[in-house]
């Protein structure tokens, strides 16, 4: 699986999950989140050669098409597969609130 | 929706479904499919600017990150959303067989 365990400990050039830290204020302009100040969101990057963790029958076909037509602009793309939630604390006035923001952290990628 | 109805009738530069015809023999090297000789597989292409048909909370966050950090390599990617099956005929010896190949045709795209 193209997950953090594999990708973070390798020098994989193909589609893999990469490290990305997002600072809520600096990178998103969000002042409303109190804690954390930012988080390891990660992102997916890398080419999707035939056959590299392909998602559907279509993406397998497209990768094969790409192999036969190397100059083509039609190719699978490296995108998130498994996403995890992020617990945050924000204030409503003086009152702290805890919320789980769903689908915020990329744990693994796929070629789609 | 970034579907064939919208995308094929517009000059949309952003993420949209594009026309792609795949010839089974020429483009995939597949000789085993008798009918059809090829099919309109389509593909997804185009940038995913803030905020363009984003898929999850993560892709919205990433697009917003990208707007604040234009030089970053972390960005959502245009990938298939709705896929449809393709009916094919192939021969087992002299005997024709009809099969539905699932997830073969792209009907719409999303930024993931």
């Amino acid at each position: 699986a193209l997950d953090t365990n594999y990708c973070f400990s390798s020098t994989e050039k193909n589609c893999c999950v990469r490290q990305l830290y997002i600072d809520f204020r600096k990178d998103l302009g969000w002042k409303w989140i109190h804690e954390p100040k930012g988080y390891h969101a990660n992102f997916c990057l890398g080419p999707c050669p035939y056959i590299w963790s392909l998602d559907t029958q279509y993406s397998k076909v497209l990768a094969l098409y790409n192999q036969h037509n190397p100059g083509a602009s039609a190719a699978p793309c490296c995108v998130p597969q498994a996403l995890e939630p992020l617990p945050i604390v924000y204030y409503v006035g003086r009152k702290p609130k805890v919320e789980q923001l769903s689908n915020m952290i990329v744990r693994s990628c796929k070629c789609s | 929706a970034l579907d064939t109805n919208y995308c094929f009738s517009s000059t949309e530069k952003n993420c949209c479904v594009r026309q792609l015809y795949i010839d089974f023999r020429k483009d995939l090297g597949w000789k085993w499919i008798h009918e059809p000789k090829g099919y309109h597989a389509n593909f997804c292409l185009g940038p995913c600017p803030y905020i363009w048909s984003l898929d999850t909370q993560y892709s919205k966050v990433l697009a917003l990150y990208n707007q604040h950090n234009p030089g970053a390599s972390a960005a959502p990617c245009c990938v298939p959303q709705a896929l449809e099956p393709l009916p094919i005929v192939y021969y087992v010896g002299r005997k024709p067989k009809v099969e539905q190949l699932s997830n073969m045709i792209v009907r719409s795209c999303k930024c993931s």
Epitope: K31, W32, G93, R94, K95 | Q57
Partner: antibody, heavy 120, light 108 residues
Framework: DVQLVESGGDLVKPGGSLRLTCVAS????????MHWVRQAPGKGLQWVAY????????YYADSVKGRFTISIDNSKNTLYLQMNSLKTEDTATYYC?????????????WGQGTLVTVSS | ETVLTQSPGTLSLSPGERATLSCRAS???????LAWYQQKPGQAPRLLIY???SRAPGVPARFSGSGSGTDFTLTISSLEPEDFAVYYC?????????FGQGTKLEIK
């Protein structure tokens, strides 16, 4: 230049529905919490609802809870207020406003307002 | 909910005079959860002061805010003709956000 422009206000009968729209421009829309505030004719200001963009956390004043829905279309930089089961006491000019940054905060930019009249 | 009471209801003064507007909260707001707005007929409110004492961008220096706890004051040091309007205080310490009933500042 930051601009908020409301529309959708109209004359409606009690029990009717209306959708207000607020289009934002001149800033990164998804960075600020958005509010609706109303003002009955000749009266003071009353907070109605807020929504946090992208994460879609929303909260309502007790007087509108269950009848009004605040929502956002991030792709269109647009804030909405869907108003159902309207009452005569909902008659007011409705303003959209953005906060300085926190969920509850001072509101630094306001739209010009759109008038909703509920009357039979 | 927190009730804000503004006084006086109407204040009649002349240009050049000093205006002092009061806002009292039914419970303590701390020192930084109060804002002041100016509203002219047919217009939207305009933010003047936030955090009890910080001037919003573009607001003239003649406007100042002070106070903490339950008692807050908006002062206009020397009234200009364009200052005659209705002024509202707003608290954002607790949900729901509430506004005072307003003070009308009129020309004497």
């Amino acid at each position: 230049d930051v601009q908020l422009v409301e529309s959708g206000g109209d004359l409606v009968k009690p029990g009717g529905s209306l959708r207000l729209t607020c289009v934002a421009s001149g800033y990164t829309f998804s960075s600020n919490v958005m509010h609706w505030v109303r003002q009955a004719p000749g009266k003071g200001l009353q907070w109605v609802a807020y929504v946090i963009p992208i994460v879609d956390i929303a909260y309502y004043a007790d007087s509108v809870k269950g009848r009004f829905t605040i929502s956002i279309d991030n792709s269109k930089n647009t804030l909405y207020l869907q108003m159902n089961s309207l009452k005569t006491e909902d008659t007011a000019t409705y303003y959209c406003a953005r906060t300085l940054g926190l969920v509850l905060d001072a509101m630094d930019y306001w739209g010009q307002g759109t008038l909703v009249t509920v009357s039979s | 909910e927190t009730v804000l009471t503004q006084s006086p209801g109407t204040l009649s003064l002349s240009p050049g005079e000093r205006a002092t507007l009061s806002c009292r909260a039914s419970q303590s707001l701390g020192s930084s959860y109060l804002a002041w707005y100016q509203q002219k007929p047919g217009q939207a409110p305009r933010l003047l002061i936030y955090g009890a004492s910080s001037r919003a961008p573009g607001v003239p220096a003649r406007f100042s805010g002070s106070g903490s706890g339950t008692d807050f004051t908006l002062t206009i040091s020397s009234l200009e003709p364009e200052d005659f309007a209705v002024y509202y205080c707003q608290q954002y310490a607790d949900s729901p956000i509430t506004f005072g009933q307003g003070t009308k500042l009129e020309i004497k």
